[in-house]
Interface confidence: low
């Protein structure tokens, strides 16, 4: 009833819950005395669904019948319309439109833990928009039967709140499961198990892991487990990626030694358990350990480069240069590395140990032949050394590889390519390609970097340390035994014109000609490797076209001699710079007049 | 022989800071793990903080975090616990201990084989 229906009635034939389908009549009658007053032929009865009027009767009852009612909920409401008055809501009726259950599906059942309690869930199939009972019945040897329903709208799991014990594991227990409606009711198919098929263990806890002499191949994983507990699954990967290794082990008693980890790497470990070999399920996996492994002694071998720089008649500077270890080669923190200097005919020798650097300089006599080793240490012990011979490395002009050329080569990549020196090209053992920034004042701070290149390739992509608009300096080597070759060139991975000219600090007269000085272009402006500088001149106040004389650009020229201006003439100069994308705009502007005798 | 000496102990009002010390000698690598631990009367040891001597891992009970600050200076062999924003239920003896092997957490007093002997931090007003 919806209200107190004083008035009148609203009653629901064949009942208030009727299935989806299904033809109901809903009859409106008014109680004695509580039609419209003086008027009673008048009384106007309507029906409403909702709030949409659906039929109207006048007297004292109204009789509908009602079909394709929706499942759900659907709200009726009789209301007596008199003349010159408002509507009167006399009583209403819901009626619920559903179906009978489904006969559950999927009825399984799980013991969480030797000690937890067991619990069933299961597949309801389609809502049945009607309160539905949920009934679960487990019944076990000696007729013992436990029941527990559950009124919840979408009722589909149970807990029994017992507990199976591992007294009699083989001991068979069916569970069913009954869902009840107004409609009807449908009971699951029974589910047998036991005890072994539902307990599902705890999963292991108080995982730890301990290397035997801190050493990464005496590796034993420790954990606890329920007591019943046959089967364990290992999973374990390197904190960095996604792949899992995978290990099984019977009887493991709470410990298993791992035999393939990584040194110094942090791994992740997982367990899950088992009760036994083919019954039952797996656990969740274990709460993650992260632990790092110890280091070992490196592998592998630094690739170790140098410069030689000549300092005077009897002494040159020597900068090695190395890359680090990989990190399955350092197999540990790298604390220092150790380079060793000696000259190989008298036997001296200088040992260092740098930290933080991966290179080292230092100077010494132009005399006697020089060898250095370098060595990466870590906690546990050295790398093998790289030893190097120190040598000229352009010494040898017939071992010097031919017709170097560098092009762009997409973003940020130089292609270098060779072709192998006139001398015997089998004598060649490798090709070193170096290349580093070029700064005019040849700064030897300037990262250096370097690739190594078999013998049999005349190509290398460099990319490493490459930026747009930057020219670098690049030199193949060819290295055959004791001896070396090498050429070089000038490349970009991409250019445009440069920002601004040379600037001309001075313009000096001698003999009738000039010599212009200019500062070089900040590295900054210059947009990549500089093909030419211009130097143009005219007359000052003539509208002509300036005259010019184009310059090759060396690193090292700042200065040029013109000879071709008249004397007593005013003449204005200025410089510009190219590159292979195009010319600089103007330098600054100098006034000059040659002061020597006309001819 | 590994051995821990722990120090800075004391009185100290609520709100206040205090950096206790341990000085740890006698582990023949970095694959350690030193941890500080508290104890009042007739409770049970807990653990406060640890930190891994290898990479400076560090790990905070949840009673500590944002007030506690654990580091190491491998080069003394010293490990010190920086403790701010005290409160009364700090007030415990407090001990650091060792264990070789890289794992970090919290873990259990029974599985730390060294100790030291322990300093007392009184927080009250």
């Known amino acids: 009833k919806i209200d107190a229906c004083k008035r009148g009635d609203v009653t629901v034939k064949p009942s208030h819950v009727i299935l989806l389908g299904s033809t109901v009549n809903i009859t409106c009658s008014l109680k004695p005395r509580q039609g419209c007053f003086h008027y009673s032929r008048r009384n106007k009865l309507i029906l409403y669904k909702f709030d949409r009027r659906i039929n109207f009767h006048h007297g004292h009852s109204l009789n509908s019948q009602v079909t394709g009612l929706p499942l759900g909920t659907t709200l009726f409401v009789c209301k007596l319309a008199c003349i010159n008055s408002d509507e009167i809501q006399i009583c209403g009726a819901e009626i619920f439109v559903g179906v009978a259950p489904e006969q559950p599906q999927n009825l399984s059942c799980i013991q969480k833990g030797e000690q937890g309690t067991v619990a069933c869930t299961w597949e309801r199939g389609r809502d049945t928009h009607l309160y539905t009972e949920y009934t679960l019945q487990l019944s076990g040897p000696k007729n013992l039967t436990w029941q527990k329903q559950c009124k919840d709208i979408y009722c589909d799991y149970l807990d029994f709140g017992i507990n199976l014990t591992p007294e009699s594991p083989e001991s068979n227990f069916t569970a069913k499961v009954t869902a009840v409606n107004s409609l009807g009711s449908s009971s699951s198919l029974p589910s047998t198990f036991t005890f072994l098929d539902i307990v599902r263990p705890l999963p292991p806890w108080d995982i730890r892991i301990k290397f035997q002499k801190a050493s990464v191949s005496r590796c034993t994983l420790y954990w606890r487990d329920e007591g019943l507990v046959l089967l364990n699954r290992l999973r374990y990967r390197p904190s960095n990626s996604r792949l899992w290794n995978m290990v099984n082990v019977t009887k493991a008693k709470g410990r298993h030694d791992l035999l393939d980890l990584k040194p110094f790497t942090e791994y992740e470990f997982q367990i899950s358990s088992k009760l036994h070999l083919y019954k039952g399920s797996w656990s969740d996996w274990s709460e993650s350990l992260r632990a790092q492994t110890p280091e070992e002694e490196p592998t592998g071998m630094l690739d170790v480069w140098y410069m030689k720089r000549h300092i005077d008649y009897s002494r040159q500077q020597i900068s090695l240069f190395w890359k680090n270890l990989s990190v399955s080669e350092a197999r540990g923190k790298i604390l220092h590395y150790q380079v060793t200097l000696q000259e190989l005919t008298g036997g001296k020798a200088m040992t260092q140990n740098i930290t933080g650097h991966t290179s080292w300089t230092t100077v010494i006599p132009r005399t006697g032949n020089w060898a250095v080793a370098v060595s990466a240490a870590n906690s546990k012990g050295s790398s093998l050394p790289t030893r190097i011979n120190i040598m000229n490395l352009c010494e040898a002009g017939l071992l010097a590889p031919r017709q170097v050329s560098a092009n762009s080569e997409g973003m940020d990549n130089i292609l270098v390519t060779w072709q192998p020196p006139r001398k015997d090209p089998s004598a060649v053992q490798e090709y070193v390609v170096e290349w580093r920034e070029l700064h005019p004042g040849g700064d030897t701070q300037v990262p250096l970097n370097w690739l190594r290149s078999r013998p049999y390739n005349v190509s290398a992509l460099i990319s490493e340390n490459i930026k747009s608009y930057i020219c670098y300096e690049i030199r193949v080597y060819a290295l055959s035994g004791d001896q070396g070759g090498c050429s070089s060139i000038l490349g970009n991975s991409k250019h445009k014109a440069p920002l601004s000219g040379p600037h001309i600090n001075a313009i000096t007269e001698e003999k009738g000609s000039i010599l212009i000085s200019w500062n070089s272009i900040p590295v900054q402006e210059q947009m990549g490797c500089l093909l030419h500088y211009r130097i143009y001149w005219k007359e000052r106040d003539s509208n002509s076209q300036p005259q010019l004389c184009e310059i090759p650009y060396r690193v090292s020229q700042n200065s040029h001699p013109i000879n071709s201006l008249q004397p007593r003439v005013t003449y204005v100069l200025w410089m510009t710079a190219l590159t292979a994308a195009g010319e600089s705009s103007h330098g600054n502007e100098r006034e000059f007049c040659l002061q020597g005798k006309a001819n | 022989e590994v051995q821990l000496v722990e120090s800075g102990g004391g009185l100290v009002q609520p709100g206040g800071s205090l950096i206790l010390s341990c000085a740890v000698s006698?582990?023949?690598?970095?694959?350690?793990?030193i941890a500080w631990f508290r104890q009042t009367p007739g409770h049970e040891r807990e653990g406060v903080s640890s930190?891994?001597?290898?990479?400076?891992?560090?790990y905070y009970a949840d009673s500590v975090k944002g007030r506690f600050s654990i580091s190491r200076d491998n080069a003394k062999n010293m490990v010190y616990l920086q403790m701010n924003s005290l409160k009364p239920e700090d007030t415990a003896v407090y001990t650091c201990?060792?264990?070789?092997?890289?794992?970090?957490?919290?873990?259990?007093?029974?599985?730390?084989?060294?100790w030291g002997q322990g300093t007392q931090v009184t927080v009250s007003s």
């Open positions: 006698g582990f023949t690598s970095d694959y350690y793990v």
């Open positions: 201990a060792a264990r070789y092997d890289t794992l970090l957490g919290g873990g259990r007093p029974r599985e730390f084989p060294y």
């Open positions: 930190i891994r001597i290898g990479d400076g891992a560090t």
